[in-house]
């Protein structure tokens, strides 16, 4: 079945942008001016997931790349990664659970909770130029709040 998708960028609540850091990693850093063109454009898709009042299941792909953010166990720890997929088959309504994030939207702030690992969130560090990761704490040092910006084509 077809899915609703949109193109967007994400910035954390400290206004750090997300950029590629090598082929399979994202990092967060402050960008200005023309450097803003480096930020990753996501294709966010509305997918099937478990129901909850204010959680909306989405998948986060990299626009025009066959890469999706996914959550897997590595060394017994929930870990965020960029995973290659067959572009002929993605996005799809029934995404595998590792690709699904529960988008929580409150006052124009977004959180992305892993569907595979409840209470683990896409996170950035306070420090500059550090990897985007899956964090198991909210409201601590690490940042779990993001804003979304539609991308004009």
């Amino acid at each position: 079945a077809p899915v609703r998708s949109l193109n967007c960028t994400l910035r954390d609540s400290q206004q750090k942008s997300l950029v590629m850091s090598g082929p399979y990693e994202l990092k967060a850093l402050h960008l200005q001016g023309q450097d803003m063109e480096q930020q990753v454009v996501f294709s966010m898709s509305f997918v099937q997931g478990e129901e909850s009042n204010d959680k909306i299941p989405v998948a986060l792909g990299l626009k025009e790349k066959n890469l999706y953010l996914s959550c897997v166990l590595k060394d017994d720890k929930p870990t965020l990664q960029l995973e290659s997929v067959d572009p002929k088959n993605y996005p799809k309504k029934k995404m595998e659970k590792r690709f699904v994030f529960n988008k929580i939207e409150i006052n124009n702030k977004l959180e992305f909770e892993s569907a595979q690992f409840p209470n683990w969130y896409i996170s950035t560090s306070q420090a500059e130029n550090m990897p985007v990761f899956l964090g198991g704490t909210k409201g601590g040092q690490d940042i779990t709040d993001f804003t979304m910006q539609f991308v004009s084509s």
Epitope: L6, M44, N53
Partner: antibody, heavy 119, light 108 residues
Framework: EVQLVESGGGNVQPGGSLRLSCTAS????????MAWVRQAPGKGLEWVGI???????YYASWAKGRFTISRDNSKNTVYLQMNSLRAEDTATYYC?????????????WGQGTLVTVSS | DIVMTQSPSTLSASVGDRVTITCQAS??????LSWYQQKPGKAPKLLIY???TLASGVPSRFSGSGSGAEFTLTISSLQPDDFATYYC??????????FGQGTKLEIK
């Protein structure tokens, strides 16, 4: 005050075109998903389509090809371009903001603008 | 496309009554269902989303239930302000968003 105001409605002949506008005040439309919903006189609500970013628009099957939704973030306005209009397109057209991205429901509505297609 | 069917089309009731409106989807839509209230000449107002969550500012006499393909909107004790037309809406059906045909709640 947060509100949406539609404009551009009126009388048009069958086969004609019309462009409706929906302007937001009290908030920025730039990162809001905006839909159009219509209601024929004395009838129920009918979803027309929705726009996310300017490249991501979705339409009811009956609206594809004749109706186009676009946005101008600098004017805080969303548009509905309607072509090849028919008598059955006579309706009040509402714009509405999606409550949350992909929620599919609409918590903020405009007052509507009436389109009459008649010769 | 998913079709939403409401029943009854018209419902006559009195102030203080408990009333229930039903919405059926042509296939399972999980809990992706919203309810709206509309008064003549006015825009619709969101009452309930995700089948059972009350929208901001909506009185607690309104409640929603159901999942899959069968849903209900209940008003526990009708107030004069509640006489209006009510619509259900499928909010999660792929790229299409469909409304029911409406239920007119009128004074008996």
């Amino acid at each position: 005050e947060v509100q949406l105001v539609e404009s551009g409605g009126g009388n048009v002949q069958p086969g004609g075109s019309l462009r409706l506008s929906c302007t937001a005040s009290g908030f920025s439309l730039s990162n809001s998903a905006m839909a159009w919903v219509r209601q024929a006189p004395g009838k129920g609500l009918e979803w027309v389509g929705i726009i996310y970013d300017s490249a991501s628009t979705y339409y009811a099957s009956w609206a594809k090809g004749r109706f186009t939704i676009s946005r101008d973030n600098s004017k805080n306005t969303v548009y509905l371009q309607m072509n090849s209009l028919r008598a059955e397109d006579t309706a009040t057209y509402y714009c509405a903001r999606e409550r949350a991205i992909f929620s599919g429901d609409f918590a903020l509505w405009g007052q509507g603008t009436l389109v009459t297609v008649s010769s | 496309d998913i079709v939403m069917t409401q029943s009854p089309s018209t419902l006559s009731a009195s102030v203080g009554d408990r009333v229930t409106i039903t919405c059926q989807a042509s296939q399972s839509i999980s809990s992706y269902l919203s309810w709206y209230q509309q008064k003549p000449g006015k825009a619709p107002k969101l009452l309930i989303y995700r089948a059972s969550t009350l929208a901001s500012g909506v009185p607690s006499r309104f409640s929603g239930s159901g999942s899959g393909a069968e849903f209900t909107l209940t008003i526990s004790s009708l107030q004069p302000d509640d006489f209006a037309t009510y619509y259900c809406q499928n909010t999660g059906g792929g790229i299409n968003i469909a409304f029911g045909q409406g239920t007119k709640l009128e004074i008996k």
